[in-house]
């Protein structure tokens, strides 16, 4: 058992059939010695008496708000919540393996820039008594601070018969550098409690490895006098780090038919500026990737051709 | 470079940028391999790495890129010996067309540009033995090439700066 | 995109010698080492060796060594290999293939496969 | 060389079945291990490299694992068009090998 914040403690259990549980003793907080009885909840039914009550926490049932009084008068409360560990593998009940970039992945982070500010989201098909907590800093063994805002429900999708429901939240490194090489990563531990139930899930990363540009914007399309052919030019994103000479693009442009199946050629170009052929029904797409470092490319920003 | 000349800021940024992308193409993004999973705080902390003060930054360039251009070669000939050393000749044995390579070659011939014959800078000590086991040698050569790119990435910033405002 | 093309299929007299060709297309031929393999009827995949076209260093299996001569001609992106003395169990298919641009040894591209038979 | 000693030869099971491929080396390849799938008269595929990496376009009911010595193929849900033949493959090591194989059929 470990206190989560004041008056909240959680019970870690082995978690299968006829598991013998954990004992857990309850301290009333107060001077008091006599006459103090316990409570489970809102039952009124008396579970013990003395300034400590001995449990055998096994099930939900054996976790809740432990009360204890005197003369009618609360004087203390122990919240009791169960974190599950099945065959050695702690319970990931609450939220949704996204699968992506490989399995076990519940917390996905992106950075639009190398300023220390990431946004990390995780997804639930639960929609009530459930609360987050985050807390963030980098390295662990001797950890620099990281702040993290206030979870909020950002997204809410209907999945067949299912609601999903998006949480996110936006964290800042306290002192970034955003030139230097990263040595130690960033550690996010989101805490889940739904119910009774507690979950912990972890992140792990570089910002480096989770930058995601925003797409190019200000695409502009000039035809060419007595040519098929068009100039295109666009500008990096105004959520870029700068200056753009240290912190650069690369792009890759493409021209899409209308149809799917069309085959499209891909470019790749370091400038700002393209010329290209552009059918009348085509449109044309460009979109942007740290130019040193392999992560994710932004997503397409289009202009019709037309 | 030493004494306070300026490199040859094009050169640099053309051979920093093949550099990348060879570190790249020696080790592509592997979904399953999460490497910092193997107790990484430990293993790269005798790496170079560029850091806050050395000013590798904008504006610490502007001041004095004599600080970052040191730092920059350190590491350059330390991935260089690493390249070098039987953890990348030993077995999985790597084809004679990998990348790696030429990436060991881009390294000296980087670290060269940046210090012409007769200069010497004071060079960092060179890494302890490699393991004897495959995989424990697989497992070093993923993450000294997973660090380079990530040095590599931060000298060629460097050196796409210079070459764009420090020029003569 | 990288394709591999092989001669056609080679019925051959014991003794004799065979020269199987793989012209490759879709990539720079001098970047990339090109290996063969082989495959006896209803039998497993053999590794026999491979060459580097940009310095034509050919490295055999060891088993192969005096049985095959693996070469390259640069200008047109052409790999051969050559079995000398044929017997009836060199009677396989053959398959030239090129490996992961991360110089590691499996195999992303194969050629088409050329049946060579051994007989009298 | 690195003898790749691969078991079943033969295995017979049904659409849906979860079908489980071993290969054992002779001594250690750190996780240097590729499969690959040979349909009957086609040439070998690659399904996957670093013994568990899916090559690009590879449907994920294909799964590796193992290090070291042992290694295993998995396919969770066999489909019909997996009838096929079956290969590990070594490149930790000159020569590189082949297990000889594992012809899969569907009940």
């Known amino acids: 058992i470990w206190e989560l914040k004041k008056d909240v403690y959680v019970v870690e259990l082995d978690w299968y059939p006829d598991a013998p549980g954990e004992m857990v003793v309850l301290t009333c907080d107060t001077p008091e010695e006599d006459g103090i009885t316990w409570t489970l909840d809102q039952s009124g039914e008396v579970l013990g008496s003395g300034k400590t009550l001995t449990i055998q926490v096994k099930e939900f049932g054996d976790a809740g708000q432990y009360t204890c009084h005197k003369g009618g008068e609360a004087l203390s409360h122990s919240l009791l919540l169960l974190h599950k560990k099945e065959d050695g593998i702690w319970s990931t009940d609450v939220l949704k393996d996204q699968k992506e970039p490989k399995n076990k992945t519940f917390l996905r982070c992106e950075a639009k820039n190398y300023s220390g500010r990431f946004t990390c989201w995780w997804l639930t098909t639960i929609s009530t008594d459930l609360t987050f907590s985050v807390k963030s800093s980098r390295g662990s063994s001797n950890p620099q601070g990281v702040t993290c805002g206030a979870v909020t429900l950002s997204a809410e999708r209907v999945r067949g018969d299912n609601k999903e429901y998006e949480y996110s939240v936006e964290c800042q490194e306290d002192s970034a550098c955003p030139a230097a090489e990263e040595r130690l990563p960033i550690e996010v531990m989101v805490d889940a409690i739904h119910k009774l139930k507690y979950e912990n899930y972890t992140s792990s990363f570089f910002i480096r490895d989770i930058i995601k540009p925003d797409p190019p914007k200000n695409l502009q399309l000039k035809p060419l006098k007595n040519s098929r052919q068009v100039e295109v030019s666009w500008e990096y994103p105004d959520t870029w780090s700068t200056p753009h000479s240290y912190f650069s693009l690369t792009f890759c442009i493409q021209v899409q038919g209308k149809s799917k199946r069309e085959k499209k050629d891909r470019i790749f170009t370091d400038k700002t500026s393209a010329t290209v052929i552009c059918r009348k029904n085509a449109s044309f797409s460009v979109q942007a990737q740290d130019r040193y470092y392999s992560s994710s490319w932004s997503e397409w920003a289009s202009v019709p051709c037309s | 470079v030493p004494g306070g000349s300026s490199p040859a800021w094009a050169q640099c940024q053309q051979l920093s940028q093949k550099l990348c992308t060879l570190a790249w193409s020696a080790h592509p993004l592997v979904g399953h391999m999460d490497l910092r999973e193997e107790g990484d705080e430990e293993t790269t902390n005798d790496v170079p790495h560029i850091q806050c003060g050395d000013g590798c930054d904008p504006q610490g360039l502007r001041d004095n890129s004599q600080f970052c251009l040191q730092r920059i070669r350190q590491g350059l000939i330390f991935y260089e010996k690493l390249l070098g050393s039987d953890i990348f000749t030993g077995e999985p044995s790597l084809l004679p067309d990998s990348p790696v390579g030429q990436l060991h070659a881009s390294l000296l011939g980087l670290s060269q540009l940046l210090q012409p014959e007769g200069h010497h800078w004071e060079t960092q000590q060179i890494p302890s033995p490699s393991p004897s086991q495959p995989w424990q040698r697989l497992l070093l050569r993923f993450k000294i090439l997973r660090s380079l790119q990530a040095f590599v990435a931060v000298a060629a910033r460097v050196f796409a700066h210079g070459a764009a405002t420090l020029s003569p | 995109q990288v394709q591999l093309v092989q001669s056609g299929a080679e019925v051959k007299k014991p003794g004799s010698s065979v020269k199987v060709s793989c012209k490759a297309s879709?990539?720079?031929?001098?970047?990339?080492?090109i290996h063969w393999m082989r495959q006896a009827p209803g039998q497993g995949l053999e590794w026999i060796g491979y060459i580097y076209p940009r310095d034509d260093s050919p490295k055999y299996n060891e088993n192969f060594k005096g049985k095959v001569t693996i070469t390259a001609d640069k200008s047109t992106s052409t790999a051969y290999m050559e079995l000398s003395s044929l017997r009836s169990e060199d009677t396989a298919v053959y398959y030239c293939a090129i490996p992961d641009r991360s110089g590691y040894a499996w195999f992303i591209y194969w050629g088409q496969g050329t049946l060579v038979t051994v007989s009298s | 060389d690195i003898q790749m000693t691969q078991s079943p030869s033969s295995l017979s099971a049904s659409v849906g079945d979860r079908v489980t491929i071993t290969c054992k080396a002779s001594r250690d390849v750190a996780i240097a291990v590729a499969w690959y799938q040979q349909k009957p008269g086609k040439v070998p595929k690659l399904l996957l490299f670093w013994a568990s990496t899916r090559h690009t376009g590879v449907p994920d009911r294909f799964s590796g694992s193992g290090s070291g010595t042992d290694f295993t193929l998995t396919i969770s849900s066999l489909q019909p068009e997996d009838l096929a033949d079956y290969y590990c493959?070594?490149?930790?090591?000159?020569?590189?090998?082949f297990g000889q194989g594992t012809k899969l059929e569907i009940k």
């Open positions: 493959h070594q490149y930790s090591s000159y020569p590189f090998t």
């Open positions: 879709g990539y720079t031929f001098t970047d990339q080492t």
